[in-house]
């Protein structure tokens, strides 16, 4: 009577996490009676998965069918693989007992299970930087498997060189994780500039999946200022004008002082935006040239997105023939009180 | 439709011989092993004979000597020849599937009756 | 041998009922128990097998539990077709070995 033998074929079956997984089984011989059973590893802690002789294994079924004796295949079905499901599953033959007593098993199947990666989150800095600094954006994405991934970045469409990627854990896994930091130097051009991390993966059959984040999120694009004045057709008055320029985000306080003293505090509106996602904006002021004594000094101060003020001053000017026209008897404020405080554009 | 018919029950004299016979049809008897239970009128049910698919047999204590087991694969049948009849041998005879896995019984005849008086 | 032992020998119930038979092996079998119904003049129906599968066919009303040596069958809820002698059987080992049986009556 030729000894039994119990037939595993595969060494090993990948399949993709959603399927189902066929491992199959057969004996060479029916005798002695009793069950054939599945485990999932090897040694006192494998893991029951289908029992021939009882038990409810909602997941399992077997190939054919079991009542059919003289078919000597006890292959199963798994079906919903997901990556916990992943290890080396044994068909292991038993002679009936009290207990039963394990007379032979399989060479074992590594049941492998390909995960596709969650979507690349992409995460930007906390707080914005400006132009010429540095910046580090994080790509996250979970539970692929096998552990084998490929991640690119990409600035504005070119592949960036500057970046750290760990995959976790370093050993054997039922599904990995992927973690990169880039690091990206800022341009005074980047409100519009975009970065995306890219993951190519066996699952995902050649259509990388990608996460983006923006750098307008990040940048900080400072203003400069720039004061001037322009004459009035009233002859007493002049306009002095604060031109804030390329400036992002759009957050901003204006705030004129006279000689030290605030006069008017402006929040910025009515912006003209610039090709490259920055903004401009102006403050004036009507000035009654008349009102002078001594030589007057306004000041355009700017505190830009909470960052601490910045100021340009402006000594004003006034001509000789500006200065005829006012009576020795007029005094009274510099700022023409009959006219708004200031207005912009 | 799976199927177990036995024959070959019926009066015979202490010390005599009977030969019960069972056919199968819609399964491999060979596949199985198969069984013969007997139930003595209004008593319990005793397990007599078996007979596995290597061709191994098995008896209770009471028949061994006296009873053999057989099958003839191309009738797909099973066989009990019953020598040295007994009084206490009274009894109504089914063959019966064991399953497959773990010889549990699935599939029972309709018994065949045999009576041992003089 | 083997020595399988029932309780009660008989019962009586009625209609609707939840009934539990017990059986119980000298030593240890394992869960290769079976449970039959044999209803008068008719040959056993083979009801459950490893001490809680059920054949095909079998009604869920009828539930197998146990291991070892302490056995029970449950039957939900008592049906006309239900009334017959219930047997416990072993077959972990050669001899097989039946229960004496359970008659189950209408009250």
């Known amino acids: 009577e030729e000894e039994l033998q119990v037939i595993q074929p595969e060494k090993s079956v990948s399949v993709t996490a959603g399927e189902s997984a066929t491992l199959n089984c057969t004996v060479t011989s029916l005798i002695p009676v009793g069950p054939i059973q599945w485990f999932r590893g090897a040694g006192p802690g494998r893991e029951l998965i289908y029992n021939l002789k009882e038990g409810h294994f909602p997941r399992v079924t077997t190939v054919l069918d079991p009542t059919k004796r003289n078919n000597m295949d006890f292959s199963i079905h798994i079906s919903n693989i997901t990556p916990a499901d992943a290890g080396t599953y044994y068909c292991v033959k038993f002679r009936k007992g009290s207990p039963d007593v394990e007379l032979k098993s399989g060479a074992g199947t590594e049941l492998s299970v390909r995960a596709k990666p969650s979507a690349p989150v992409v995460s930007g800095p906390t707080a914005r930087a400006t132009p010429e600094h540095t910046v580090s954006f994080t790509c996250e994405s979970h539970g692929f498997s096998p552990r084998d991934i490929t991640l690119k970045w990409f600035k504005n469409g070119n592949e960036l060189s500057d970046f750290q990627t760990n995959v976790d854990p370093a050993g054997k896994s039922v599904s990995y994780s992927i973690r990169s930091t880039a690091r990206v130097v800022l341009t005074r051009r980047d409100v519009h500039s975009q970065v995306i991390c890219e993951v190519a993966h066996v699952t995902l059959q050649g259509d990388p999946l990608r996460g983006t984040a923006n750098l307008s999120e990040a940048i900080r694009v400072p203003p400069t200022l720039e004061v001037f004045q322009r004459p009035m057709r009233a002859e007493n008055q002049v306009n002095v004008t604060c031109q804030v320029r390329k400036f992002y985000p759009q957050r901003l306080l204006l705030t004129w002082l006279e000689n030290g003293n605030v006069s008017q505090t402006e929040t910025a509106s009515t912006l003209t935006e610039n090709k490259d996602g920055t903004y401009n904006w102006r403050s004036w002021l009507l000035v009654n040239t008349c009102a002078h004594r001594d030589g007057v000094v306004l000041t355009c101060q700017v505190e830009h997105d909470g960052q601490p003020a910045v100021s340009k001053s402006h000594a004003l000017e006034v001509s000789a023939h500006q200065k005829e026209q006012c009576s020795d008897t007029t005094s009274g404020p510099v700022l023409a009180p009959t006219a708004p405080l200031g207005g912009s554009g | 439709e799976v199927q177990l018919v036995e024959s070959g029950g019926g009066l015979v004299q202490p010390g005599g011989s009977l030969r019960l016979s069972c056919a199968a049809s819609?399964?491999?008897?060979?596949?199985?092993?198969m069984h013969w239970v007997r139930q003595a009128t209004g008593k319990g049910l005793e397990w007599v004979s078996a007979i596995g698919t290597a061709g191994d047999t098995y008896y209770t204590g009471s028949v061994k000597g006296r009873f053999t087991i057989s099958r003839e694969n191309a009738k797909n049948s099973l066989y009990l020849q019953m020598n040295s009849l007994r009084a206490g041998d009274t009894a109504v005879y089914y063959c019966?599937?064991?399953?497959?896995?773990?010889?549990?019984?699935?599939?029972w005849g309709q018994g065949t009756m045999v009576t041992v008086s003089s | 041998d083997i020595q399988m032992t029932q309780s009660p020998s008989s019962l009586s119930a009625s209609v609707g009922d939840r009934v539990t038979i017990t059986c119980r092996a000298s030593?240890?079998?394992?869960?290769?128990l079976a449970w039959f119904q044999q209803k008068p003049g008719k040959a056993p129906k083979s009801l459950i097998y490893?001490?809680?599968s059920l054949h095909s066919g079998v009604p869920s009303k009828f539930s197998g539990s146990g291991s070892g040596t302490d056995f029970t069958l449950t039957i939900s809820s008592l049906q006309p077709e239900d009334f017959a002698t219930y047997y416990c059987?072993?077959?972990?080992?050669?001899?097989?070995?039946f229960g004496q049986g359970t008659k189950l009556e209408i009250k």
């Open positions: 490893t001490a809680s």
């Open positions: 059987q072993q077959y972990v080992s050669y001899p097989y070995t």
């Open positions: 819609g399964f491999t008897l060979s596949s199985y092993d």
């Open positions: 019966v599937r064991g399953g497959v896995w773990d010889d549990a019984f699935d599939i």
């Open positions: 030593q240890d079998i394992n869960n290769y």
